[in-house]
């Protein structure tokens, strides 16, 4: 007799995990045999899907391989064309160890900002998520929060939050990790010790020191009057993220000094700046009084006669002092290039010393002149022809500009170092030496005056000139 | 030799003025720098002034505005005016060669401020 | 101004010792371009004008016995008279010229 299909196995509740067999039995009493169809959330399987296998006239349902996204309400509809089609349905859940979908990755950020570092994940049951810094687990606080998604929030980022962070997905099933990524926190640049301001004597040696930190540890610069330091030494050294830096400075004239610290963060730059001011005691007085200043020597033709950073006065009666007194130089000095090899290192140290007079500390920065004694022995014994020679040119009036006169002194109007040896300037390229061979007689060729010793004073009456006339 | 001869100290009330005059002799006098330093009884030397080659004066705190400095190359002759002398300035009163040491003295000369 | 301290204020000695004067400047006397020191000592016996024994802190003056030497820098100076004679009783000053020029106090020497 025909009989009406009845469902005696109802579809139940079906957990699989991804990858495994899922199957779903919907047995069927009915005469004639019915057809029996599948439906996953009310859309028909169709019988040729390769992922499904449909068996036992219909009443076996087999998913091969599941995937996450097979998780649904599956039906079984059982017609035979006797009373009315019949329907059971059952859930597939499919179970899933944690999987981390959207891991977090490196991130830099700016102290004070927030910082998000994202872990999406999946899995079922619904994994939970922890993070790990360094080795321990991380402690959430009033600043730290992991989100809903498992995302790691922290605001107001601060140094000691930078460091290695890994997310943790975790469920009944298993657990997942995800790679070690770097929170880098960058600190703009900020100045823990700014310079200080000096009132220092003329001539002196002065040291500022800046300090500064950041993230990246910062550079600094050194700005005088506005401009990066010409001249000076800088000393620098990093520890602990800190960094020293000393300027050393000889004092010729006063200046603001400005430290400016300085870092990058992408493309763009973090700067802070402290300043210091070093005046000179009674400063104006060398320029009132004593028609010109003291200055280092920045010039190039006395260079190699002339003592590393020598102060040396330049005349204010010219307009630019510098300019003036080097064309004055340079115009002597090419004259000098036909002399003998005897008389040019002499006359050379003799004419950048005269020029550009050494300057003296006292009361008042004062240039000192050359001593008479080496004056007299670039004329009277190194360069006895040659000045000769131009003194007679000199009376026939051979020379078109006096510029090359004022190069050259007046021996007798230059102080003796024999009644005070701290009067004048001794030109060192001149001095005795009793290991050097090229020794010279004592001059004779004219008769000093009563207040012109021999040179040198005590130690020997012979002169010499550095080996192969050296004037480095 | 160089020598060095002071004169024109004495006895001057406070409030007074003197003027002392050293003659150099035996060096160059126009080429050199000059100064004035003086000795209280009993007590430590005190620098205060000096004149450089182009007679530009530079002086001690102490006596600055009171007491001037002065050359006279053709002389060689070295001055100092001392005014509104007070009774603390009373010293022995030394002529002094020298730029950066003080390389040549004089024997001195007497000045008390007493009334 | 710049301030010499000098000690002791007096020493006595017996003819052949040796003799250490010190010196200190309230700020260093060294001039950066020269790099010399910018300090003297002098010598004045009783009843007589000082003299110059050594300048730039080391340089002894002509004339001036070999005893006498003078070593030091930046702040600290000594003169040191390495085998005293009778008419070395004196007193001895230091005095710096790096600026306006100031004296020490002064050591009185007296020979035993």
């Known amino acids: 007799l025909p009989k009406a299909p009845v469902i005696t196995t109802p579809l139940e509740t079906v957990d699989a995990l991804v990858e495994e067999v899922a199957t779903f039995m919907c047995a069927v009493e009915s005469y004639p045999q019915p057809e029996i169809s599948w439906t996953r959330n009310k859309i028909l399987i169709k019988l040729f899907d390769t992922r499904y296998s449909i068996r036992e006239n219909g009443q076996l349902l087999t998913i091969l391989s599941v995937e996450d996204s097979d998780d649904g309400i599956y039906c079984c509809t059982a017609n035979n064309g006797v009373g009315g089609a019949v329907e059971s349905c059952g859930a597939l859940q499919v179970k899933m160890k944690p999987k981390i979908t959207r891991p977090p990755i490196n991130v830099k950020i700016i102290e004070g900002l927030k910082a998000v570092l994202p872990c999406t994940t999946m899995g079922n049951p619904k994994p939970s998520v922890s993070w790990i810094k360094g080795d321990s687990p991380l402690r959430e606080n009033s600043r730290t929060a992991v989100l809903e998604s498992g995302s790691l929030r922290i605001h107001n980022v601060q140094k000691e939050d930078a460091g290695q962070y890994r997310c943790v997905a975790k469920n009944s099933l298993g657990t997942a990790y995800s790679k070690v990524v770097k929170l880098e926190v960058e600190v703009f640049a900020r100045i823990l010790r700014a310079p200080e301001s000096h009132n220092v004597t003329f001539g002196s040696f002065v040291t500022l020191h800046c300090t500064a930190t950041g993230i990246p540890v910062p550079t600094i610069t050194w700005i005088e009057n506005g401009n990066a330091v010409s001249s000076g030494s800088i000393q620098e050294s990093v520890k602990d993220r800190v960094i020293d830096s000393r300027l050393q400075l000889f004092i010729t004239k006063p200046g603001l000094y400005t430290c400016i610290a300085t870092n990058k963060h992408g493309e763009k730059f973090s700067t802070a700046k402290a300043a210091a001011t070093v005046s000179i005691a009674e400063w104006s007085k060398p320029q009132k009084d004593n028609k010109g200043y003291c200055a280092q020597y920045r010039g190039e033709v006395c260079n190699a006669v002339l003592a590393k950073d020598a102060l040396v006065f330049l005349n204010t009666s010219y307009a630019d002092p510098e300019e003036a007194q080097e064309l004055l130089v340079h115009t002597a000095w090419n004259e000098l290039k036909v002399v003998s090899p005897l008389c040019r290192p002499a006359a050379e140290a003799l004419l950048c010393n005269h020029v550009f007079q050494e300057c003296s500390p006292g009361v008042v920065p004062t240039p000192i002149p050359i001593c008479r004694e080496y004056c007299l022995a670039v004329k009277e014994l190194f360069c006895a022809k040659e000045w000769l020679a131009m003194e007679e040119k000199t009376h026939r009036g051979l020379y078109r500009s006096e510029m090359h006169l004022l190069s050259v002194p007046e021996c007798s109007k230059l102080p003796s170092m024999h009644w005070d040896p701290t009067a004048c300037a001794r030109l060192p390229h001149l001095d005795y030496n009793k290991e050097n061979p090229k020794t010279f007689p004592p001059m004779t060729s004219s008769k000093p005056s009563v207040d012109i010793p021999n040179l040198p004073s005590s130690s020997s009456s012979s002169f010499s000139v550095s080996p192969t006339y050296s004037m480095t | 030799e160089v020598q060095l001869v002071e004169s024109g100290g004495g006895l001057v009330q406070p409030g007074g003025s003197l003027s002392l005059s050293c003659v150099a002799s035996g060096f160059t006098f126009s080429l050199y720098y000059m100064n004035w330093v003086r000795q209280a009884p009993g007590k430590g030397l005190e620098w205060l002034s000096v004149?450089?080659?182009?007679?530009?004066?530079y002086y001690a705190d102490s006596v600055k505005g009171r007491f001037t400095i002065s050359r006279d190359n053709v002389k060689n002759t070295l001055y100092l005016q001392l005014n509104n002398l007070k009774p603390e300035d009373t010293a022995l009163y030394y002529c002094?060669?020298?730029?950066?040491?003080?390389?040549?003295w004089g024997q001195g000369t007497q000045v008390t401020v007493s009334s | 101004d710049i301030v010499m301290t000098q000690s002791p204020s007096s020493v006595t000695a017996s003819v052949g010792e040796k003799v250490t004067i010190n010196c200190k400047s309230s700020q260093s006397v060294v001039f950066g371009s020269n790099q010399k020191s910018y300090l003297n000592w002098y010598q004045q016996r009783p009843g007589q004008s000082p003299r110059l024994l050594i300048y730039?802190?080391?340089t002894q003056e002509s004339g001036i016995p070999d005893r006498f030497s003078g070593s030091g820098s930046t702040t600290d100076f000594t003169l040191t008279i390495s085998s005293v004679q009778p008419e070395d009783a004196a007193v001895y000053y230091c005095?710096?010229?790096?600026?306006?020029?100031?004296f020490g106090s002064g050591t009185r020497l007296e020979i035993k």
């Open positions: 002094v060669l020298g730029r950066t040491a003080l390389v040549r």
């Open positions: 005095q710096q010229a790096y600026s306006a020029p100031t």
């Open positions: 004149i450089d080659t182009h007679s530009i004066a």
């Open positions: 730039y802190a080391s």
